[in-house]
């Protein structure tokens, strides 16, 4: 997360970090009891490492009383999901048995409705991605609040250049922004799961160029479909 | 500060039900969920379940189901624990607490003595 | 359900003695471990989470420690406040379960 700040600790009861041989590699968001939704792309970066996920964590490195790590029985990327396309950016892992839900476990109520999010729209994106330009990464989660950007300004020349789909989301990235390390991590409405961070190469905290999110209300019959 | 009020005394006929209050003040209700403790005389603690107020979401023991219904309401800041079917064995302490991100019950009440008896 | 048995039901004890409660889980608990005290008059209080952290508050003769199955609390300096009845409580596997609990009474 750029230009953001340390976020309350476990107030965001939905977070989880996805890690592959104990290393942070993605975000993501437990949204029920046995399932992390994250960005597809994580997958590959993570070769034939045994990927868990992390929940009830603040700190990566920090021992702390709700912290913890899960392995992972079933990774189910999107099935339209490409290496060279951020098109279908999903990942559902089911975990390798239910999450113990409780202050600092919860899963995140997901949009439905596929509706567009109203331009300006203040979003919550959190993360434990690098915090700056040189590659720090924080131990602590981090988050920002940034303003939901129309898809027309999103698909200019200058910017995305018609890149992002109807499935797809942008969000202002001047100085603010989310960036490596929190693709798969979630993009939070009015307290309701929008969009998940995408999992590109994208340059992070130039404004022409923003952030993009994959609709999770666009994809809503196949995570019901993973989930039944 | 922080006060979990809970009546000291109730007492109820076999077979009858009983819904404990547990009046919260002092923070924001929904921001914590509320656990629920039993103990019977000269006995230790057993944990009956926990609730969260701001969707009401629960974990119950399995000794407890069908014993125990847990429920909040949010408007007055009081968690209640409906105990049916009672009988001598539900004779005890009950005790709600405030359960936080630590995993641990930071406030308790000063606990109700419920006494089933004809 | 995971047991958790403190086999000292009762302990006699002196003003600043340095007393040591233990506490033993049925199963590997990895350190998700709380410590709770109650006053003769019913009052319960949270002193130790995580195994090793003292709550806010708690005066600071009070330490916990353990790992794996075996735990333990320690007063380092007994004072007449301390005289209670300590409980371990275990947050690994659902159901929460508590100790039995140790009574400390004075000699």
């Known amino acids: 997360i750029l230009g953001g700040r340390e976020a309350e600790a476990h107030a965001r009861p939905y977070m989880a970090s996805v890690q592959v041989n104990g290393e942070h590699l993605c975000g993501g968001v437990l949204v029920a009891e046995q399932w992390v939704l994250s960005a597809a792309h994580c997958l590959e970066d993570a070769a034939d490492g045994k990927v868990q996920v992390l929940l009830g964590a603040h700190s990566l490195s920090q021992p702390e009383p709700s912290k913890r790590l899960y392995d992972v029985l079933r990774a189910v990327p999107h099935p339209d999901s490409r290496p060279d396309t951020i098109d279908h950016d999903l990942l559902l892992l089911q975990l390798s048995e239910k999450a113990t839900l409780g202050p600092a476990v919860r899963p995140l109520p997901w949009q439905r409705v596929d509706r567009d999010v109203e331009p300006g729209t203040l979003c919550d994106v959190a993360g434990w991605g690098i915090v700056s330009h040189a590659g720090r990464r924080p131990d602590r989660l981090q988050h920002v609040l940034l303003p939901v950007l129309d898809r027309a300004t999103c698909n200019r020349r200058t910017h995305h250049d018609g890149a992002i789909t109807q499935r797809m989301m942008c969000a202002e990235s001047n100085r603010r922004d989310s960036c490596k390390g929190d693709s798969g991590g979630p993009l939070v409405c009015g307290g309701v799961l929008e969009g998940v961070v995408t999992s590109g190469s994208r340059v992070c905290g130039n404004r022409k160029k923003p952030g993009i999110y994959t609709r999770v209300a666009s994809y809503a019959a196949w995570i019901d479909s993973v989930l039944a | 500060q922080v006060q979990l009020q809970q009546p000291g005394t109730e007492l109820v006929k076999p077979g009858a039900s009983v819904k404990l209050p547990c009046k919260a003040s002092?923070?924001?209700?929904?921001?914590?969920?509320m656990q629920w403790v039993k103990q019977r005389p000269g006995q230790g603690l057993e944990w009956i379940g926990e609730?969260?107020?701001?969707?009401?979401?629960?974990n119950y023991n399995q000794k407890f189901k069908g014993k125990a219904t847990l429920t909040v309401d949010t408007s007055s800041t009081t968690a209640y624990m409906q105990l049916s079917s009672l009988t001598s064995e539900d004779s005890a302490v009950y005790y709600c607490?405030?359960?936080?991100?630590?995993?641990?019950?930071?406030?308790w009440g000063q606990g109700t003595t419920l006494t089933v008896s004809s | 359900d995971i047991q958790m048995t403190q086999t000292t039901s009762s302990l006699s004890v002196s003003l600043g003695d340095r007393v040591t409660i233990s506490c033993r889980a049925s199963?590997?608990?990895?350190?998700?471990l709380n410590w709770y005290q109650q006053k003769p008059d019913g009052t319960v209080k949270l002193l130790i989470y995580?195994?090793?952290r003292l709550h806010s508050g708690v005066p600071s003769r009070f330490s916990g420690s353990g790992s794996g199955t075996d735990y333990s609390l320690t007063i380092s300096n007994l004072e007449p406040e301390d005289i209670a009845t300590y409980y371990c409580?275990?947050?690994?596997?659902?159901?929460?379960?508590f100790g039995g609990g140790t009574k400390l009474e004075i000699k």
């Open positions: 409580q275990q947050y690994s596997k659902l159901p929460w379960t």
């Open positions: 609730i969260d107020p701001s969707d009401t979401y629960i």
């Open positions: 199963q590997d608990i990895t350190n998700y």
């Open positions: 002092g923070y924001t209700f929904t921001s914590y969920w």
């Open positions: 995580f195994t090793s």
């Open positions: 607490a405030r359960y936080t991100t630590i995993m641990a019950s930071d406030y």
